[in-house]
């Protein structure tokens, strides 16, 4: 069974998948469509790296540009380093600038919805 066939079989169970499962799935060459990706739990999507999302979505990663104003895409973009976003070739903006340090202050982030940044 190839990655795409596997994805079709598990698609209906993905809504509540935790981050660890999504990371594992990104190694399976599944090419998740964007509509399915956007139904995932926001808290499960946010920790994924650019490389992991690229592997998870495959060719459909191109659609992030078209959906950049909608959650969870918008929130995920804000968590990524701009340098990493640039590798997607989509002109996505709003990532963390080069030289900034991301502090994982869970309480602050829960309140503000965005990561805490320390400047260079």
């Amino acid at each position: 069974m190839n990655g795409s066939e596997y994805f079709v079989k598990i698609q209906s169970f993905l809504g509540g998948a935790p981050t660890e499962d999504l990371k594992a799935l990104s190694q399976q060459n599944v090419s998740m469509d964007l509509a399915t990706f956007m139904k995932l739990r926001t808290d499960a999507v946010l920790p994924l790296t650019v490389a992991e999302v690229q592997k998870l979505l495959g060719p459909h990663v191109e659609g992030l540009k078209a959906e950049e104003r909608h959650r969870p895409v918008r929130d995920w973009i804000l968590r990524q380093r701009q340098d990493d976003l640039d590798t997607l070739g989509l002109g996505l903006q709003g990532g963390i600038p080069n030289g900034y340090l991301v502090l994982d202050l869970s309480m602050q982030e829960a309140l503000s919805g965005t990561p805490c940044l320390l400047g260079p």
């Epitope: 469509d33 509509a35 956007m38 191109e62 659609g63 959906e67 959650r71 997607l88 070739g89 989509l90």
Partner: antibody
């Protein structure tokens, strides 16, 4: 003004390969994916695949998976599509098309590839 | 693969009259989160490259005359030319960009009656 200028018409023998170029101008080349679509004479449109010009990652329609290679040269803002093991049914106009998000916002003028013995 | 079925194959309409083209997909093209339908319409005039008219099923591309409109959601979509002009003679294609391989409808040829 966005422009996609493709290479000229080609005549190839069965079993040969063809490489079509698409030179982009009028926009930041690495900010938009490039797609390739073909159209056989008098027929409809068929999506062949797409490529991320920033990373060079490419994705192909499984119908062409073993025969197609898409590449880019960032220094010249040019995309390439190479199709190998040509057969008569590959005779078609090949288009490059720049993505607008997912849809195909700008198209090249097309390159006619004729496969004939 | 998602199958796109267009109807009719050809259409002859008098100048100034309405032309309606239908497109049906074999599965939904709706993103239920963003409410965007991943469907585009293209116009191909004789001897020319295709040109984008509509994306997200109903959003008109800039520069496209407002006599062109798109509607529909899920699996059923329509392209309408409200008042046909001579320069609208072309083949019109729908395309899904929901899941690869991105597929096109077979095309609808619009002619003047």
């Amino acid at each position: 003004e966005v422009q996609l200028v493709q290479s000229g018409a080609e005549v190839k023998k069965p079993g040969a390969s063809v490489k079509v170029s698409c030179k982009a101008s009028g926009y930041t080349f690495t900010n938009y994916w490039m797609h390739w679509v073909r159209q056989a004479p008098g027929q409809g449109l068929e999506w062949m695949g797409n490529i991320n010009p920033s990373s060079g990652d490419s994705y192909y329609n499984e119908r062409f998976m073993s025969r197609v290679t898409m590449t880019v040269d960032k220094s010249t803002s040019t995309a390439y599509m190479e199709l190998s093991s040509l057969r008569s049914e590959d005779t078609a106009v090949y288009y490059c098309a720049r993505s607008g998000g997912l849809w195909l916002a700008f198209w090249g003028q097309g390159t006619l590839v004729t496969v004939s013995s | 693969d998602i199958v796109m079925t267009q109807s009719p194959d050809s259409l002859a309409v008098s100048l100034g009259e309405r032309a309606t083209i239908n497109c049906k997909s074999s599965q939904t093209l709706l993103n239920s989160v963003s409410q965007n339908n991943y469907l585009a319409w293209y116009q191909q005039k004789p001897g020319q490259s295709p040109k984008l008219l509509i994306y997200f099923a109903s959003t008109r591309e800039s520069g496209v005359p407002d006599r062109f409109s798109g509607s529909g959601s899920g699996t059923d979509f329509t392209l309408t030319i409200s008042s046909l002009q001579a320069e609208d003679v072309a083949v019109y294609y729908c395309q899904q960009h929901y899941r690869t391989p991105y597929t096109f409808g077979g095309g609808t040829k619009v002619e003047i009656k």
